[in-house]
């Protein structure tokens, strides 16, 4: 049976999933899919990691933990009622039928208050990693507005500047999300 998680329309949903790497850096592939875990793989894949990196993701789906340490929890940005349903987290452990499978049921409730487009509530208690400057997902900014047409060099530079800046700490403490992909 699935474990149930809840979020409101317009919020970010957090679907926890973890595994213990056999040794540091000895990562295993992980896939996230919409729909219950099938016998093999994930159906309707929304995000995938390999032994080194996040190698596939779709819009609004990202990892805000450190997947290199075994935190492969999924965040879905700005959810709508259509995001309701079962999600599969599959830890693809080598060997026949060794995979760990987690079916998580996401229930989306209508928003109590219409969220302002450029503001986000403080979800730091709910989300393990609200600020990350590592490449765990697509480029997105929620308090500063979007980052149009920024090339990889600029992103890398911005990431380095943010990492040690007071701005980064202020944003983290306020619960804002800055992700540099």
């Amino acid at each position: 049976s699935e474990v149930e998680y809840r979020a409101e329309v317009g919020q970010n949903a957090y679907l926890p999933c973890f595994y213990t790497p056999a040794a540091p850096g000895n990562l295993v592939p992980v896939c996230w899919g919409k729909g219950a875990c099938p016998v093999f793989e994930c159906g309707n894949v929304v995000l995938r990691t390999d032994e080194r990196d996040v190698n596939y993701w779709t819009s609004r789906y990202w990892l805000n933990g450190d997947f290199r340490k075994g935190d492969v929890s999924l965040t879905i940005e700005n959810v709508t009622l259509a995001d309701s349903g079962i999600y599969c987290c599959r830890i693809q452990i080598p060997g026949i039928m060794n995979d760990e499978k987690f079916n998580l049921k996401l229930v989306i409730k209508p928003a109590k208050v219409t969220p302002a487009p450029t503001r986000q509530r403080d979800f730091t208690a709910a989300f393990p990693r609200m600020l990350t400057t590592r490449g765990h997902g697509p480029a997105e900014t929620q308090t500063l507005g979007s980052l149009p047409d920024i090339n990889l060099t600029q992103i890398s530079t911005l990431a380095n500047e943010l990492r040690d800046s007071r701005l980064a700490n202020d944003l983290r403490d306020s619960g804002a999300t800055i992700r540099i992909g």
């Epitope: 213990t20 540091p24 340490k69 987690f102 730091t124 208690a125 590592r134």
Partner: antibody
Framework: EVQLQQSGAELVKPGASVKLSCTAS????????MHWVKQRTEQGLEWIGR????????KYVPKFQGKATITADTSSNTAFLHLTSLTSEDTAVYYC??????????WGQGTTLTVSS | DIQMNQSPSSLSASLGDTVTITCHAS??????LSWYQQKPGNIPKLLIY???NLHTGVPSRFSGSGSGTGFTLTISSLQPEDIATYYC?????????FGGGTKLEIK
């Protein structure tokens, strides 16, 4: 062999600050989250916060924000807990622990902090 | 924050008994729950992770079960060395939280 060696007992005066250390051997702290846990005499375990030594990113229990600062020095494979404006309420044993990734598989021996005038 | 309510807070049992300690989470934590044993004057020691997985070197008389919000630690055939305080801990959401502990004594 994995070990977490913590600094020795501290006796400090109210209002002072203290910095506790936790030096790891047998693994690289960059590969794990490093945590600090408080335990007052005859009381339960209370999570203070953690650091990701790889990039310095921290998480704290709100009540310890401003009281505790967790840092790490990857060159010496050491995590630190800096406590400020000490009061008798801070008298406790402080443990460091590593997580793998969501449970604590190794713990330091604990550092006893006594705040007294 | 997720509250972890552990019961009973203290427990007295005879050698050879089967002992059960429960932990209830204020919201679902799936299987992201661990159990620790702390003997008097000692450091906490991991017993069980992911609700039911026995940590390396832990005797098989310890077992864990549960998912969602309700969890159980069972000690079968209680031994003298099991005198300790036992804690549950959720690792799903920050801030991590511990149960209040269960002090186990021998009758």
């Amino acid at each position: 062999e994995v070990q977490l060696q913590q600094s020795g007992a501290e006796l400090v005066k109210p209002g002072a600050s203290v910095k506790l250390s936790c030096t790891a051997s047998g693994f690289n702290i960059k590969d794990y989250y490093m945590h600090w846990v408080k335990q007052r005499t005859e009381q339960g375990l209370e999570w203070i916060g953690r650091i990701d030594p790889e990039d310095g990113e921290t998480k704290y229990v709100p009540k310890f924000q401003g009281k505790a600062t967790i840092t790490a020095d990857t060159s010496s494979n050491t995590a630190f807990l800096h406590l400020t404006s000490l009061t008798s309420e801070d008298t406790a044993v402080y443990y460091c622990a590593r997580s793998n990734p969501y449970y604590f598989d190794y713990w330091g021996q604990g550092t006893t902090l006594t705040v007294s005038s | 924050d997720i509250q972890m309510n552990q019961s009973p807070s203290s427990l007295s049992a005879s050698l050879g008994d089967t002992v059960t300690i429960t932990c209830h989470a204020s919201q679902t934590i799936n299987v992201w729950l661990s159990w620790y044993q702390q003997k008097p004057g000692n450091i906490p020691k991991l017993l069980i992770y992911k609700a039911s997985n026995l940590h390396t070197g832990v005797p098989s008389r310890f077992s864990g079960s549960g998912s969602g919000t309700g969890f159980t630690l069972t000690i079968s055939s209680l031994q003298p060395e099991d005198i300790a305080t036992y804690y549950c801990q959720q690792g799903q959401n920050y801030p991590y939280t511990f149960g209040g502990g269960t002090k186990l004594e021998i009758k």
